[in-house]
């Protein structure tokens, strides 16, 4: 890929909210399983960030499978628009403040903070580096601002709007959203390298989601998973380009894949996302 091939997708000054999942399994691909039944089910699509229909075979599969659209939405989506501004006097916290701390499925452990609803305090935990949920903050201060009760009777909401409990007026603050791993690519890019079950030693590449790079590994020739590419370029094309690089000042998103654009509506703004 040369620099000229790059496409620039312009978004508004407001940053695209990162994809933050309430449950790790919401990132799994739709899996129809090995059986042959034809059952209408729903799964959460991480590319469109919506619950969609798929045909389930009736056995096995994975947890990203729901009987109804409502159940899928309940488990895997959150209504951003309803959370941006809170105007009620009771100053309720964002719903994610009540989620259990979730290290996610990766193992690149880093220090993060979560709001402990039992102790009513923000506390430290170890985050694996990908997925998890929104009760996950880079700093203790950020966690306190968003989830703890403020000292003067106000609650700072998660998009930086401070609510004054006396007159219920809104005071804008610096916009800061909990900054998790921003995953916009295929779910298998998050899986670890898997040699498989045979005895060959083939040179392959896998995407290391913790460091954000494609790395070589030895493939046994059978089994394994889909995080397995014959060249570094193929690996980068499939996985690296699926991770949208967030640039806070310029409001630019660079993506290198030249594919047909698909318009996706995300909460309060429209952006262009590439088809994978």
């Amino acid at each position: 890929d040369s620099e000229e091939d790059e496409e620039h997708t312009i978004i508004t000054d407001t940053e695209l909210p990162p994809l933050k999942l309430m449950h790790s399994f919401c990132a799994f691909k739709a899996d129809d399983g090995p059986c042959k039944a034809i059952m209408k089910r729903f799964f959460f699509n991480i590319f469109t960030r919506q619950c969609e229909e798929f045909i389930y075979g009736g056995c096995e599969g994975n947890q990203n499978r729901f009987e109804s659209l409502e159940e899928c939405k309940k488990m895997c989506t959150r209504d951003n628009a309803n959370r941006i501004i809170k105007t009620t006097l009771q100053q309720e916290k964002p719903d994610f403040c009540f989620l259990e701390e979730d290290p996610g499925i990766c193992r690149g452990y880093i220090t993060r903070y979560f709001y402990n609803n039992q102790t009513k305090q923000c506390e430290r935990f170890k985050y694996g580096g990908c997925l998890g949920n929104m009760n996950n903050f880079e700093t203790l201060e950020e966690c306190k601002n968003i989830c703890e009760d403020g000292p003067n009777g106000f609650q700072v909401d998660n998009y930086g709007t401070q609510l004054n409990a006396v007159n219920n007026s809104l005071t804008p603050q610096s916009t800061k959203v909990p900054s998790l791993f921003e995953f916009h690519g295929p779910s298998w890019c998050l899986t670890p390298a898997d040699r498989g079950l045979c005895r060959a030693n083939e040179n392959r590449f896998y995407y290391n989601s913790v460091i954000g790079k494609c790395r070589p590994f030895k493939y046994s020739g059978c089994g394994g998973n889909e995080n397995n590419f014959t060249s570094k370029q193929e690996c980068l094309r499939a996985c690296k380009k699926g991770f949208i690089q967030r640039i806070s000042k310029g409001g630019l998103i660079k993506t290198k894949r030249k594919r047909k654009k698909q318009r996706v509506k995300i909460a309060y703004e429209e952006i262009f996302v590439k088809n994978m």
Partner: antibody, heavy 118, light 112 residues
Framework: EVQLVESGGGLVKSGGSLRLSCAAS????????MSWVRQAPGKGLEWVGT????????YYADSVQGRFTISRDNAKNSLYLQMNSLRAEDTAVYYC???????????WGQGTLVTVSS | DVVMTQTPLSLPVTLGQPASISCKSS???????????LNWLQQRPGQSPKRLIY???KLDSGVPDRFTGSGSGTDFTLKISRVEAEDVGVYYC?????????FGQGTKVEIK
């Protein structure tokens, strides 16, 4: 007063299984992540694993990953360690410990001895 | 994994005299949040471990002030200003900055 009392240790053959329990009292159990740490005879301490406050997520040391499972029952103020495919090198005193708000172990139980014979 | 190295492994001391234990880590224990998660445990003979010091220098409640912790980065020290009979036991440093948590080999403090 914070109290952690382990039980369930004993002698088991290599390849066998054992389930340890830790009864907690003197604090709001569900508010704290909990850990297991072990100490082989005459040796130092080794972290085994940790479970989150609600019990939905766990962390494990590489040496026990896939063989040991940590769980908890917040209604019973109890922490568990299910140990499968036991090896001689798993012989140790197993301690449960509470994780404080800094994600550091602050209180420890008295331990329970697990002996794996080959 | 982070390797924690304690010296000395055995420390015979005279009652009323000071004692010092060194703990070195194979990489810095300064975390991204600006805190250093280095801790000290005391294990008296036949007893379970008890936390003495956390975050390098903070004493747990009920710990006598003759114990002090210091250090930064990779080098840390536990000092006992005047050793008493009840201080006999094994002292462990351990780090909670990086996963997995790792412990030093322990320093056995005994009375001469």
């Amino acid at each position: 007063e914070v109290q952690l009392v382990e039980s369930g240790g004993g002698l088991v053959k290599s390849g066998g299984s054992l389930r340890l329990s830790c009864a907690a009292s003197g604090f709001t159990f569900s508010s704290y992540a909990m850990s297991w740490v072990r100490q082989a005879p005459g040796k130092g301490l080794e972290w085994v694993g940790t479970i989150t406050t609600g019990g939905s997520y766990t962390y494990y040391a590489d040496s026990v990953q896939g063989r040991f499972t940590i769980s908890r029952d917040n209604a019973k103020n109890s922490l568990y360690l299910q140990m499968n495919s036991l090896r001689a090198e798993d012989t140790a005193v197993y301690y449960c410990a509470r994780q404080d708000g800094n994600f550091l172990m602050d209180y420890w139980g008295q331990g329970t001895l697990v002996t794996v014979s080959s | 994994d982070v390797v924690m190295t304690q010296t000395p492994l055995s420390l015979p001391v005279t009652l009323g005299q000071p004692a010092s234990i060194s703990c070195k880590s194979s990489q810095s224990l300064l975390d991204t949040d600006g805190k250093t998660y280095l801790n000290w445990l005391q294990q008296r003979p036949g007893q379970s471990p008890k936390r003495l010091i956390y975050l390098v220098s903070k004493l747990d409640s009920g710990v006598p002030d003759r114990f002090t912790g210091s250090g930064s980065g990779t080098d840390f020290t536990l000092k006992i200003s005047r050793v008493e009979a009840e201080d006999v036991g094994v002292y462990y440093c351990w780090q909670g900055t990086h996963f997995p948590f790792t412990f030093g080999q322990g320093t056995k403090v005994e009375i001469k």
